[in-house]
């Protein structure tokens, strides 16, 4: 059962796993959620009745029954992990904590103009977990405006104390705001020979890389495959670090693979979600339960639904035993990974999907693309919405894209003459406009946020956000698309599609069925040549065939230019403007979304 509210002046008795320090009960709850075993926690706030050494302690707890006895205690705040909840969760913490000194290893000290600059420095430093900044009112003259970058083994402070005129906060790497290099390559036949900070068992190098990504101290890893000559090291995932953040020595070794933490690009790839099945593989660990299941998929579902289950092994039924049901072994361990991995025993193993919600929903695999044809099928573009106006009569106005459970990204020019959000309706999960009847459910619009530098589509800043009145429950037919990561600016997208219900030629009508067209991106330089009378800025992106024939058109405005990269769809562009439709040597011009990621985050994450 999902319990989100915090219990004031309440302490959970027993079940302690470990104690960490966090600046707030809210962040303690996040730490508990990301810990492999924590189900409940007790946080101690600052209070005159409490020993100051216990202030800001966050005790992570576990319980077989998923609950613990409650005891009244002033200044204690208790609660449950979000593991039991189905909603999206994130480790991103933008809060700044005033008059708190978060202790850790101070490895870098420099002058900064503001706490924001200090936080940016921390975000762009590979080792930094959190920072403390001495403001210009700090009593000691030589420490004023000093920005201390800090790290610890756990990624959380070793202690937190009250200190006047300082502020502290966390790195925003987990908010996808880092400019650090994002290197996705996995290097075959390579061992990185740097110091190990931890080791876990993993079924493949991809899982090893994901574990490294969400381990606070891991910067790169080496994985020994099941063919590795030394038997005791097979399936071993070594989590590594170095002072420079780069591997100092690489050794050519067959059957080993190495790679980097993806902490600076984590929002465009699944990190927590290990969704594959591993055949002829047994995961060993502490047994939680043994249940009958029809298939390994059913076993994975059982594991996902059991809050304490971290991984499983399914043994298929022998002949006609047990109504064709096999045995499903639900398992757990102290770190969430198998304690040993064995091959050749006939088991099928995998991980809980409970942690998938810790990844951005947008990374979830969707239906395979239908090749050929121009009409879409249901669920093919689940982020696409149709925006209707009800004045003077109801009609399709523009396209848009779901980017969060309360947010639609669209074009600013769609709202010319729209006096109020009250006349707007957002329909999601729609394939045919004819599905929309009077009783079809829709999302009302609470607020229209138009970029304040927008004047007209052709001069740029053609971007707007719609805040919905109610939240979208994600399903196969309505789910978000990932925003491009700033770290992926160098990516050259080759699989891009424009979608919408717009005209199929310049003089036409709105289409009933959602249309799609695969369109190549065009360099801004090439695009500028085609639009001599306009300024094609870096905040615009162009797409189209030289010979024309496929393009967005009237009614597609505000809809997505969706590009697939590394198996994940990204919202690369917003349909904005163009000369005619699908004309020769006149590419479509789109708002270049990567250039507005900061603006989007600022608007959608504002308190």
């Amino acid at each position: 059962e999902c319990v989100t509210q915090l219990l004031k002046d309440t302490c959970f008795e027993g079940g302690d796993i470990t104690t960490v320090f966090t600046p707030s009960a809210k962040y303690c709850q996040v730490v508990c959620t990301y810990h492999p075993r924590c189900l409940l926690f007790t946080f101690t706030a600052e209070s005159p009745s409490e020993d100051p050494t216990r202030w800001f302690t966050c005790v992570l707890k576990d319980s077989v029954t998923e609950t613990l006895p409650r005891v009244n205690r002033t200044a204690a705040i208790s609660g449950y992990s979000f593991k039991q909840c189905s909603h999206q969760i994130s480790a991103c913490n933008k809060d700044i904590y005033v008059d708190l000194d978060m202790k850790g290893i101070n490895y870098n000290s420099s002058v900064a103009k503001s706490a924001q600059e200090c936080q940016e420095r921390c975000t762009d430093d590979v080792h930094c977990h959190f920072f403390t900044y001495a403001t210009r009112q700090f009593p000691s003259l030589e420490h004023r405006n000093i920005c201390l970058l800090k790290h610890t083994q756990t990624g959380t402070p070793t202690r937190i104390t009250k200190l006047d005129k300082v502020v502290s906060g966390f790195s925003l790497k987990s908010c996808a705001l880092s400019n650090l290099a994002c290197i996705r390559d996995i290097f075959p036949n390579t061992v990185f020979a740097d110091s190990n900070i931890d080791s876990v068992m993993a079924p493949d190098a991809f899982v090893c890389g994901r574990i490294c990504t969400h381990h606070p101290g891991c910067l790169f890893f080496t994985f020994f495959s099941q063919e590795w000559p030394k038997e005791s090291q097979r399936n071993l995932c070594l989590l590594k670090t170095s002072e420079s953040g780069l591997p100092s020595t690489r050794i050519k070794k067959s059957k080993a693979l190495s790679g980097f933490s993806l902490q600076s690009c984590r929002h465009s790839i699944p990190v927590f979600c290990h969704s594959s099945f591993y055949h002829d593989t047994d995961f060993l660990g502490e047994e939680l339960d043994i249940v009958a299941a029809k298939s390994h998929e059913a076993c994975q579902k059982l594991c996902t639904n059991a809050v304490r289950c971290q991984f499983f092994t399914y043994t298929p039924a022998q002949a006609s035993c047990n109504e064709g049901k096999g045995k499903c072994y639900l398992k757990l361990s102290s770190n969430g990974s198998p304690t040993k991995i064995l091959h050749g025993r006939g088991g099928i193993s995998g991980y809980t999907l409970r942690l998938c919600k810790m990844d951005n929903e947008c990374t979830t695999k969707i239906k395979p693309r239908i090749v050929g044809g121009t009409a879409s099928v249901r669920g093919e573009w689940p982020w696409q919405v149709t925006l209707h106006t009800t004045s003077p009569t109801q009609r399709h106005l523009c396209g848009g894209s779901i980017i969060g459970n309360q947010w639609i990204l669209t074009a600013a020019h769609c709202f010319y003459g729209v006096e109020s959000p009250k006349i707007l309706r957002v329909y999601s999960g729609i394939l045919n406009q004819s599905e929309i009847k009077e009783d079809t459910s829709f999302f009302g619009v609470q607020e229209i946020i138009i970029h304040d530098q927008y004047k007209m589509a052709e001069s740029g800043y053609d971007i707007a956000l719609l805040k919905l009145e109610t939240t979208v429950n994600y399903t196969d037919s309505q789910r978000p698309i990932c925003l491009p990561s700033k770290g992926d600016r160098n990516v050259i997208y080759t699989d891009c599609w424009v979608t919408g219900w717009g005209y199929r030629k310049l003089r036409d009508k709105i289409q009933n069925t959602l249309q799609k067209a695969k369109i190549p991106l065009v360099t801004n330089e090439e695009c500028q040549k085609r639009y001599r009378g306009h300024k094609i800025t870096h905040k615009m992106i162009c797409a189209g065939y030289r010979e024309g024939g496929k393009d967005a058109c009237k009614g597609d405005s505000g809809g997505p230019l969706s590009c697939k990269h590394n198996e994940v769809w990204h919202l690369v562009g917003i349909t904005s403007w163009g000369e005619g439709c699908a004309q020769r040597e006149r590419p479509g011009v789109y708002t270049n979304v990567v250039e507005y990621v900061d603006w989007i985050l600022e608007k959608t994450q504002a308190v």
Epitope: D124, V126, S178, N179, L180, A181, I183, R184, D185, F187, L219, E243, S244, G245, L246, P247, S248, R250, N490
Partner: nanobody
Framework: QVQLQESGGGSVQAGGSLRLSCAAS????????MGWFRQAPGKEREGVAA????????FYADSVKGRFTISQDNAKNTVYLEMDTLKPEDTAMYYC?????????????????WGQGTQVTVSS
């Protein structure tokens, strides 16, 4: 000690090409970030392209994407910048830089070793 030596600059007509080279000595360029930066008179130094030499991952500024290509030859300890379809606004002093740590690859303040620079002039 670490030394970076740029070469290959010169004058060229708009639309032309140049290939800049950066030879590194005093350290092995096999697991570093190497970057090309440029500075036009009266302007700030800006990142153009960078490469992680341990795996050839590349990073480009939007203004040069699709026109410039950064590459490496580990055997020669050299990084190259292939510049095609040059424009007058590409005119600047081009510097090679190296950082033997994990960094934001197009930020000049993150690099600790710098070359003397090579001039590129593009006339219309």
């Amino acid at each position: 000690q670490v030394q970076l030596q740029e070469s290959g600059g010169g004058s060229v007509q708009a639309g032309g090409s140049l290939r800049l080279s950066c030879a590194a000595s005093g350290f092995t360029a096999s697991s570093n970030f190497m970057g090309w930066f440029r500075q036009a008179p009266g302007k700030e130094r800006e990142g153009v392209a960078a490469i992680y030499t341990g795996g050839a991952s590349t990073f480009y500024a939007d203004s040069v994407k699709g026109r410039f290509t950064i590459s490496q030859d580990n055997a020669k300890n050299t990084v190259y910048l292939e510049m095609d379809t040059l424009k007058p606004e590409d005119t600047a002093m081009y510097y090679c830089a190296a950082a033997p740590r994990w960094i934001a690859p197009l930020r000049a303040d993150r690099y600790e070793y710098w070359g003397q620079g090579t001039q590129v002039t593009v006339s219309s």
